[in-house]
């Protein structure tokens, strides 16, 4: 969380940014917040970016002003304009891109005075990871697959009976370039699988972690993901 | 007045690299993107990325990522652009242009061409 | 990726008459935040560079001659030359300026008869 003070003139305001991660070919959010004013025509809100020319995005007088918005940004950012009189400045940022990351920053004005904050965005990508018994497999093996990932994640393999085991030796983990040459597909085989036990594959880069779990008995197979962004800071 | 000179002509042989510059006169080189253009002869033009003089940062169109560089010199105002792993199909005339506003295009002011021939 | 589809390749020209020429994009060019359509036309003779003649879809770049007229909005733009000149001639590029990565039509040739 980063919390921001204007420093202009004799008032100034409370600006709060959380830091948060973008999904590259999806859409991302920008959190920003402020203290609210009671006429949208006084409020303004900037976003912007860090080494970048042009404005990211520019709200006044209750609507968008984008005459001097950065060609990299063009068409992919709104706010949520029915929001901003209750103090909510985010951004949503579509389609987002490896090089959307860096720092913005999210400047205020409104009629108590101004402030602004900083976020740090970063993008890669991630997503969740299925497991499922490959029974084309001559012994018992998991296999672990997640479509999407950047940068290269690591995968480790742990399994709830066998707590603190390394599976390094009996697993196999390849990446494979999606079609966009960016993102790649995560795929891990885990052999000699014991049934009755729980096992979980982890992923992880510095975005993202994300866990697929399995449970294999004689009578069931049970799976369960999630997946947790990394360093959510707020300022 | 807005100029940029282009580095000359340049005859290289199927895997190697050329680096082709375009040096910028008549305004302040940060305040402005650079951006890179490929013609292949008689041909339409292709858009091959952007650059920032002002931290150097780079955009790429995907198709030239890894086949393209492109870098600044601020000491010299001078944008740059690398070739790499050339075949023949990299035998075009390659434009640098500078954008009309601060924060962005169209393309107002180019650069004479740099002729590029990739030849055994 | 937007494409730009330009028509016709070529046209047959006679000094003073009025020529009209067509570019459809793939997607929309129009941006509501700015009020814009961000489409640019360039003409570019043998052995030179692209020349800038109109950018967002119809604002002519200073010392443009005032015979040529951008008009359209979303995906369907032209180019127009009220009397065309011999100078004219040339090849007439229009660019996707909205969204990375930009891209040009095939352009259209202007020749005289």
């Known amino acids: 969380l980063i919390i921001g003070f204007g420093i202009s003139g004799r008032h100034s305001i409370t600006v709060t940014t959380v830091a948060s991660a973008g999904n590259i070919g999806e859409d991302g959010i920008l959190s920003c917040t402020f203290e609210p004013d009671i006429k949208l025509s006084d409020i303004v809100i900037q976003w912007l970016k860090e080494g970048v020319l042009g404005l990211v995005h520019e709200f006044k007088e209750g609507k968008d002003e984008l005459s001097e918005q950065d060609e990299m940004f063009r068409g992919r950012t709104a706010v949520f304009a029915d929001q901003v009189i209750v103090g909510n400045a985010s951004l949503r940022l579509k389609n987002v891109q490896l090089t959307d990351a860096g720092t913005y920053k999210c400047y205020i004005i409104t009629s108590k005075g101004k402030g602004n904050a900083n976020l740090e965005y970063k993008t890669g990508a991630f997503s969740m990871p299925e497991v499922n018994v490959d029974y084309n497999a001559s012994s018992e093996t998991l296999r672990c697959e997640a479509p999407r990932w950047f940068p290269q994640p690591t995968v480790v393999w742990a399994s709830q009976v066998d707590q603190g085991a390394n599976f390094s030796e009996v697993s196999n983990t390849s990446f494979e370039l999606n079609s966009e040459n960016v993102t790649m597909k995560v795929v891990s085989v885990l052999y000699n699988v014991t049934i009755n036990n729980t096992y979980s594959c982890m992923i992880e880069n510095d975005i993202a972690k994300a866990t697929g779990d399995i449970k294999v008995t004689e009578s069931e197979i049970k799976r369960r993901s999630h997946l947790q962004l990394l360093n959510s800071k707020a300022s | 007045e807005v100029q940029l000179q282009q580095s000359g002509p340049d005859l290289v042989k199927p895997g190697a690299s050329v680096k082709i510059s375009c040096k910028a006169s008549?305004?302040?080189?940060?305040?402005?993107?650079i951006h890179w253009m490929k013609q292949s002869h008689g041909k339409s033009l292709e858009w091959i990325g952007r650059?920032?003089?002002?931290?150097?940062?780079?955009i790429y169109n995907q198709k030239f990522r890894g086949k393209a560089i492109l870098t600044v010199d601020q000491s010299s105002n001078t944008a740059y652009m690398e070739l790499r792993s050339l075949t023949s199909e990299a035998s075009a005339v390659y434009y640098c242009?500078?954008?009309?506003?601060?924060?962005?295009?169209?393309?107002?002011?180019w650069g004479q061409g740099t002729l590029v021939t990739v030849s055994a | 990726d937007i494409v730009m589809t330009q028509s016709p390749s070529s046209l047959i020209v006679t000094a003073g008459e009025k020529v009209t020429m067509s570019c459809r994009s793939s997607q929309s060019l129009f941006d509501s935040g700015s009020q814009r359509n961000y489409l640019t036309w360039f003409h570019q003779k043998p052995g030179r560079p692209p020349k800038l003649l109109i950018y967002w879809a119809s604002t002519r770049e200073s010392g443009v001659p005032d015979r040529f007229t951008g008009s359209g909005s979303g995906t369907d733009f032209t180019l127009t030359i009220s009397s065309v000149q011999t100078e004219d001639l040339a090849v007439y590029f229009c660019q996707n300026d909205y969204s990375f990565p930009f891209t040009f039509g095939s352009g259209t040739k202007l020749e005289e008869k």
């Open positions: 242009a500078r954008v009309l506003f601060y924060y962005g295009s169209p393309f107002a002011y």
């Open positions: 650059v920032n003089p002002n931290n150097g940062d780079p």
């Open positions: 008549g305004y302040s080189f940060t305040g402005y993107y």
